[in-house]
């Protein structure tokens, strides 16, 4: 299996390269504003989850799927109720994983 | 239901080895980051290994570093914890648990097995 | 390492309001986000997950239950406390290898 620190490190580069794409992410959809600090990835995919037809998330997807355990005894206490571009989702979420990243246990 | 249950506790004299062992159910074994805790005897807990999903990265505490190995075997859902040259201040209870990496956590806990070094 | 100062006791009364605190050696926090947990033990029990990152409720512990605090100053509240709320609290950082947890603070009925 691959190596947590080099899947940080990929989802890193994908969220880096789509943040520096002009053109609008996914025509410009919404996703539900979640806390990332209370949920982390997988509140993160759960947001992204909800895009279809657009390729330019779907290996952020993918990566997501692979970093989020379902069986970690987390709880988000409320339902996001603010939604916001995809494109300022994934600079939030780019922001996220570095801090992991830079002071993970690795 | 998650379930961690720890053997391999005993009485050892100074100097001596000992191998604790960790039998993990009810979650997927090998999505999660593994580690030993331990506390002595009416003292505080102590974090004191930590192991990858994958087996392939270690942690450990100094005072333990070079003495203890910790390991995994995906096959028996099993944690281990290789324990050498023990001490009088190893002793302690030794609690299995999951460690959430992200949040940096551990989220499940076993019952704990008791390790006595003592001449 | 960071060391987790914590007061050894606290004694409270049946429905009133426990604060615990913890104290790191150093800031907990990276970019907003605390790496600081709380863990419940009761007598003769492993320890248990009631708050992480500082004020997130674990699932199935609870809203009796709250935390808050950031850098280095860090509380966790109880109330009102209930008699199975008798155990020991202790506060785990997550910010630097080794992790380290705090003393324990034991709750104790007046």
């Known amino acids: 299996s691959v190596s947590l620190p080099l899947t940080l490190k990929e989802l890193i580069e994908e969220l880096s390269n789509i943040t520096q794409d002009q053109t609008p992410l996914c025509n410009g959809s919404m996703v539900w504003s979640v806390d990332l600090a209370a949920g982390g990835f997988c509140v993160a995919l759960d947001s992204l989850t909800n895009i279809s037809n657009c390729n330019a998330i779907y290996r952020t997807q993918r990566i997501l799927h692979g970093l989020c355990n379902r069986k970690a005894p987390t709880t988000v206490s409320s339902l996001p109720d603010t939604k916001i571009e995809v494109a300022h989702f994934i600079t939030k979420l780019l922001s996220y994983t570095k801090q992991l990243f830079r002071h993970g246990p690795f | 239901e998650v379930q961690l249950v720890e053997s391999g506790g005993d009485l050892v004299q100074p100097g001596r080895s000992l191998k604790l062992s960790c039998a993990a159910s009810?979650?997927?074994?090998?999505?999660?980051?593994m580690a030993w805790v331990r506390q002595a005897p009416t003292k505080g807990l102590e974090w004191v290994a930590s192991?990858?999903?994958?087996?392939?990265?270690?942690y450990y505490r100094d005072s333990v570093k070079g003495r203890f190995t910790i390991s995994r075997e995906k096959a028996k859902s099993s944690l281990y914890l290789q324990m050498d040259s023990l001490r009088s201040e190893d002793t302690a209870t030794y609690y299995c648990?999951?460690?959430?990496?992200?949040?940096?956590?551990?989220?499940?806990w076993g019952q704990g097995v008791m390790v006595t070094v003592s001449a | 390492d960071i060391v987790l100062t914590q007061s050894p006791a606290l004694a409270v009364s049946l429905g009133q309001r426990a604060t615990i605190s913890c104290r790191a050696s150093q800031s907990v926090t990276i970019s907003r986000y605390n790496r600081m947990h709380w863990y419940q033990q009761r007598p003769g029990q492993q320890p248990k997950l009631l708050i992480y990152?500082?004020?997130y409720l674990a699932s199935g512990i609870p809203a009796r239950f709250s935390g808050s605090g950031s850098g280095t100053d860090f509380t966790l509240t109880i109330y009102p406390v209930q008699a199975d709320d008798i155990a020991t609290y202790y506060c785990q950082q997550n910010r630097e290898s080794p992790w380290t947890f705090g003393g324990g603070t034991k709750l104790e009925l007046n």
């Open positions: 009810g979650f997927t074994f090998s999505d999660y980051y």
């Open positions: 192991i990858s999903n994958d087996g392939i990265s270690t």
């Open positions: 990152r500082s004020s």
């Open positions: 648990t999951t460690w959430n990496w992200e949040f940096g956590f551990f989220d499940y």
